[in-house]
């Protein structure tokens, strides 16, 4: 008879035998035989394996290098890798978060549409008519122009996307 060519999902084929895979968090020490089960051992400190596997070595946990602006968001276990994120004011340069860059600031004339997170940069938008931003900031939104009318004043200088309107007193009519 032909030896097996396939095995069930939690098994692997070796020496014409279907052996049990090692559970997540454990590595393979020795393959099964007709009379002995697969031998597995837990991963060591700072190591992990996140799938049913036949790996003879566990993977090292990711190192969150503070020199690259990284810090630990979630500590790794024997079954999961460490998750890194960036220090305050910085964000990851990639999905794998291997290094960080400073959040960009929105220049005058632009306001913050979306504040940056540990994984995404600041999103800026141009200040529309009626709004302005006169600072370079990673937090400030566009501010509405001052309403001179509500203060019983008149516009002396029109606002721009970078400057607020300048209000002044209404001219008194001379008798």
């Amino acid at each position: 008879p032909e030896p097996p060519t396939a095995c069930r999902e939690k098994q692997y084929l070796i020496n014409s035998q279907c052996c049990s895979l090692c559970q997540p968090g454990q590595k393979l020490v020795s393959d099964c035989t007709e009379f002995t089960e697969t031998e597995c051992l837990p991963c060591g400190e700072s190591e992990f394996l996140d799938t049913w596997n036949r790996e003879t070595h566990c993977h090292q946990h990711k190192y969150c290098d503070p020199n690259l602006g990284l810090r630990v968001q979630q500590k790794g276990t024997s079954e999961t890798d460490t998750i890194c994120t960036c220090e305050e004011g910085w964000h990851c340069t990639s999905e794998a978060c291997e290094s960080c860059v400073l959040h960009r600031s929105c220049s005058p004339g632009f306001g913050v549409k979306q504040i940056a997170t540990g994984v995404s940069d600041t999103i800026c938008e141009p200040c529309p008519v009626g709004f302005f931003s006169n600072v370079s900031s990673a937090f400030e939104k566009c501010h509405p122009w001052t309403s001179c009318e509500t203060k019983d004043l008149v516009v002396q200088q029109a606002g721009t996307n970078k400057t607020d309107v300048v209000c002044g007193p209404q001219d008194r009519l001379r008798a």
């Epitope: 095995c7 069930r8 999902e9 939690k10 279907c18 559970q23 007709e34 009379f35 002995t36 089960e37």
Partner: antibody
Framework: EVQLLESGGGLVRPGGSLRLSCAAS????????MNWVRQAPGKGLEWVSY????????DYADSVKGRFTVSRDNSKNLLYLQMNSLRAEDTAVYYC????????????????????WGQGTMVTVSS | DIQLTQSPSSLTASVGDRVTITCRSS??????LAWYQQKPGKPPKLLIY???SLEGGVPSRFSGSGSGTDFTLTISSLQPEDFATYYC?????????FGQGTKLEIK
């Protein structure tokens, strides 16, 4: 309630074809490996075929290899057995059965078993 | 292919008896063995998996033991509902195979 329901059985001439279906309900069908097992009248159980949860791995008993094809549609929770070139000795009740992997994380290896079975569908091959 | 041989093929016993059914494999299968109970006109029912683990909801009078090539199913005290046919199955490798069955009849 976890359930499997076979359909598609019937009387067919030798050399003919038949497609059996097995409708699954009450569990996440796409996460489980599945099997077809048959039982000829008054006889014992005979494993027929296996399919992995994704459908990419299949296996068959020597007695049906090259004639039967197992497949699945996870979006419809359906398991199929396409039976071609049928013979008199294929006459049996056909059961679909769910493979389950029993695992206790404190234990070493875990084990398989077929924990849910359909009621079966009768296939008669006769001229 | 792995052959499973059950003995005895049939067995007559009384309510309250202790009954043992054996299953021998043609090659070592470690503990990749399951036991099923089947009543006439019904599908099989899983009793034991991994040679010795009891499936949920199965009465504790059923027990399994063995590893390698020799396995046993024991019913410690037969109840009227236990009269049925019992099958062993190896899930070690494909093709998966069943024993020929043991018919347990009432004396």
């Amino acid at each position: 309630e976890v359930q499997l329901l076979e359909s598609g059985g019937g009387l067919v001439r030798p050399g003919g074809s038949l497609r059996l279906s097995c409708a699954a309900s009450g569990f996440t069908f796409g996460s489980y490996e599945m099997n077809w097992v048959r039982q000829a009248p008054g006889k014992g159980l005979e494993w027929v075929s296996y399919i992995s949860s994704s459908g990419e791995t299949t296996d068959y008993a020597d007695s049906v290899k090259g004639r039967f094809t197992v497949s699945r549609d996870n979006s419809k929770n359906l398991l199929y057995l396409q039976m071609n070139s049928l013979r008199a000795e294929d006459t049996a009740v056909y059961y679909c059965a769910r493979d389950v992997f029993f695992f206790d994380s404190s234990g070493d290896n875990g084990a398989y078993g077929m924990d849910v079975w359909g009621q079966g569908t009768m296939v008669t091959v006769s001229s | 292919d792995i052959q499973l041989t059950q003995s005895p093929s049939s067995l007559t016993a009384s309510v309250g008896d202790r009954v043992t059914i054996t299953c021998r494999s043609s090659q070592g299968i470690r503990s990749s063995l399951a036991w099923y109970q089947q009543k006439p006109g019904k599908p099989p029912k899983l009793l034991i998996y991994g040679a010795s683990s009891l499936e949920g909801g199965v009465p504790s009078r059923f027990s399994g033991s063995g590893s390698g090539t020799d396995f046993t199913l024991t019913i410690s005290s037969l109840q009227p509902e236990d009269f049925a046919t019992y099958y062993c199955q190896q899930l070690n490798s494909f093709p998966s195979t069943f024993g020929q069955g043991t018919k347990l009849e009432i004396k």
